[in-house]
C-alpha cells in the first residue's frame, strides 16, 4: 500500500488539514493495477470478457455507478457532492470485494490486496472529507444477505458476476481518479 503524508496540503479556512493528494492518487492507481491483474485471470479462465449476456447477471447486482447528478464529471462538477459519492460508492463496493475473495486461484493474494487497499483508500478520503455531510454506510445485514445470495448463484452467473464487479469497480475508480485530481 503506497505510504506518505504531504504536509504541503493546506485546507481552506473552513477545512481541516488534508491527507496527501499524492497518497490518494497512488492508492487508486495501485488498486487499478490490482484489478487489471484480476481481470486478466478472469478473462483467461472464461469467455466472460467477450460475453454479450451481461444483462442477465446485472439484474442481480446493484453496483455503484457514477451518474451526472453525482457531480464527478467535468459537466456539472461539484467537488463536495462528488467526494461524498466516491466514498459512498467505495463503501458500497466493499461487499462485492468480499465476494471476490474466494473467486481466484492464482491471484488470491491480489484479490486480498485490492480489498485491503480499498479500505485504506476509504480512510484517506474520509480524512479529506472530514467536514462534509455525514456519509451513509451500507447496512451490514443487507450486505450479509447479498453476499449469501451471490455465493448461491450457479457457476456461470458467479463467473459473470466476478467479471462485472471488476469492470464496474475499474470504471468507478477511473472516474474517481479524474475528479479527485481537480480537488
Amino acid at each position: 500500500v503506497p505510504p506518505g503524508e504531504d504536509s504541503k496540503d493546506v485546507a481552506a479556512p473552513h477545512r481541516q488539514p488534508l491527507t496527501s493528494s499524492e497518497r490518494i492518487d497512488k492508492q487508486i492507481r495501485y488498486i487499478l493495477d490490482g484489478i487489471s491483474a484480476l481481470r486478466k485471470e478472469t478473462c483467461n479462465k472464461s469467455n466472460m470478457c467477450e460475453s454479450s449476456k451481461e444483462a442477465l447477471a446485472e439484474n442481480n447486482l446493484n453496483l455503484p455507478k457514477m451518474a451526472e447528478k453525482d457531480g464527478c464529471f467535468q459537466s456539472g462538477f461539484n467537488e463536495e457532492t462528488c467526494l461524498v459519492k466516491i466514498i459512498t460508492g467505495l463503501l458500497e463496493f466493499e461487499v462485492y470485494l468480499e465476494y471476490l475473495q474466494n473467486r481466484f486461484e492464482s491471484s488470491e493474494e491480489q484479490a486480498r490486496a485490492v480489498q485491503m487497499s480499498t479500505k485504506v483508500l476509504i480512510q484517506f478520503l474520509q480524512k479529506k472529507a472530514k467536514n462534509l455531510d455525514a456519509i451513509t454506510t451500507p447496512d451490514p445485514t443487507t450486505n450479509a444477505s447479498l453476499l449469501t445470495k451471490l455465493q448461491a448463484q450457479n457457476q456461470w452467473l458467479q463467473d459473470m458476476t466476478t467479471h462485472l464487479i471488476l469492470r464496474s469497480f475499474k470504471e468507478f475508480l477511473q472516474s474517481s481518479l479524474r475528479a479527485l485530481r481537480q480537488m
Epitope: G4, D6, K8, D9, V10, A11, A12, H14, R15, L18, S20, S21, E22, R23, D25, K26, Q74, S75, G76, F77, N78, E79, E80, K128, L177, R178, A179, R181, Q182, M183
Partner: antibody, heavy 119, light 106 residues
Framework: EVQLVESGGGLVQPGGSLRLSCAAS????????MSWVRQAPGKGLEWVAK????????YYSDTVTGRFTFSLDTSKSTAYLQMNSLRAEDTAVYYC????????????WGQGTLVTVSS | DIQLTQSPSSLSASVGDRVTITCSAS?????MFWYQQKPGKAPKLLIY???NLASGVPSRFSGSGSGTDFTLTISSLQPEDFATYYC?????????FGQGTKVEIK
C-alpha cells in the same frame, strides 16, 4: 477563445499587500482547478498555489504559506490571489493557469502580471 | 521538495536537427510535464503524464521516461522551436520545475 487574463500587479513596498485577479473566458470555469505560478525576472518558474474548483481545498508552496490566500468568485469566473507581507523576493511575473480536466497538467496560462516589491 | 535538474542548461542547434533534453528528479515522480516558453510569453504545455501530446502540439515533440529520468525529444527542429523548455513534476504539492533548457540557433 479560451483565455485567462491577469490584472492587479504593480509596485508595492516591502510588507505591503496586493490582490491579483485572473478572469477566465471562453470556457466553463466551474469544473476547473486553478493555480498561480510565478517567474522572477530572468529566472525559472515557481508554483505558488492551487485552488479546487469550488474553493474547498487550497494548496500553497512553503514560501507563501500564511501570507498568500487563493480564492474564487465562480459567478464572475475569476480567481484571486491576496498577497500580504510582501517581500523583495516575491518580485515576479505572476501567471494564473487552468488545470487540465482529469489530469495534473496546467494547460491554459494567462499572459502574466508583474509584481514588483521594492522600497 | 522534489528537485528537477535539466541538462543541458542551453544548447545550440540547427533547423532539422534532432534535439534531446533530459530531466532528472531527486526521487521518483508520479507525473512529468514539459513546457515551452518564449521571451515575454507564458509557458505552453507540450507533454503531460510523461508522454501524452497536448492539444495542438506538433507530433515532432515527444516525451518519455519514468521514475527519475525523463526526456523531451524534438525530432526535427523548426524555426519556431527556438525557446526555453521546462520540465515540471507533480508528486503531491508543491509542483516543481526544472531550471530550464534554452534552445538557441547555431
Amino acid at each position: 477563445e479560451v483565455q485567462l487574463v491577469e490584472s492587479g500587479g504593480g509596485l508595492v513596498q516591502p510588507g505591503g499587500s496586493l490582490r491579483l485577479s485572473c478572469a477566465a473566458s471562453g470556457f466553463t470555469f466551474s469544473p476547473f482547478a486553478m493555480s498561480w505560478v510565478r517567474q522572477a525576472p530572468g529566472k525559472g518558474l515557481e508554483w505558488v498555489a492551487k485552488i479546487s474548483p469550488g474553493g474547498s481545498w487550497t494548496y500553497y508552496s512553503d514560501t507563501v504559506t500564511g501570507r498568500f490566500t487563493f480564492s474564487l468568485d465562480t459567478s464572475k469566473s475569476t480567481a484571486y490571489l491576496q498577497m500580504n507581507s510582501l517581500r523583495a523576493e516575491d518580485t515576479a511575473v505572476y501567471y494564473c493557469a487552468r488545470q487540465l480536466w482529469g489530469y495534473y497538467a496546467l494547460d491554459i496560462w494567462g499572459q502574466g502580471t508583474l509584481v514588483t516589491v521594492s522600497s | 521538495d522534489i528537485q528537477l535538474t535539466q541538462s543541458p542548461s542551453s544548447l545550440s542547434a540547427s533547423v532539422g536537427d534532432r534535439v534531446t533534453i533530459t530531466c532528472s528528479a531527486s526521487i521518483s515522480v508520479s507525473y512529468m510535464f514539459w513546457y515551452q516558453q518564449k521571451p515575454g510569453k507564458a509557458p505552453k504545455l507540450l507533454i503531460y503524464d510523461m508522454s501524452n501530446l497536448a492539444s495542438g502540439v506538433p507530433s515532432r515533440f515527444s516525451g518519455s521516461g519514468s521514475g527519475t529520468d525523463f526526456t523531451l525529444t524534438i525530432s526535427s527542429l523548426q524555426p519556431e522551436d527556438f525557446a526555453t523548455y521546462y520540465c515540471m513534476q507533480w508528486s503531491g504539492y508543491p509542483y516543481t520545475f526544472g531550471q530550464g533548457t534554452k534552445v538557441e540557433i547555431k
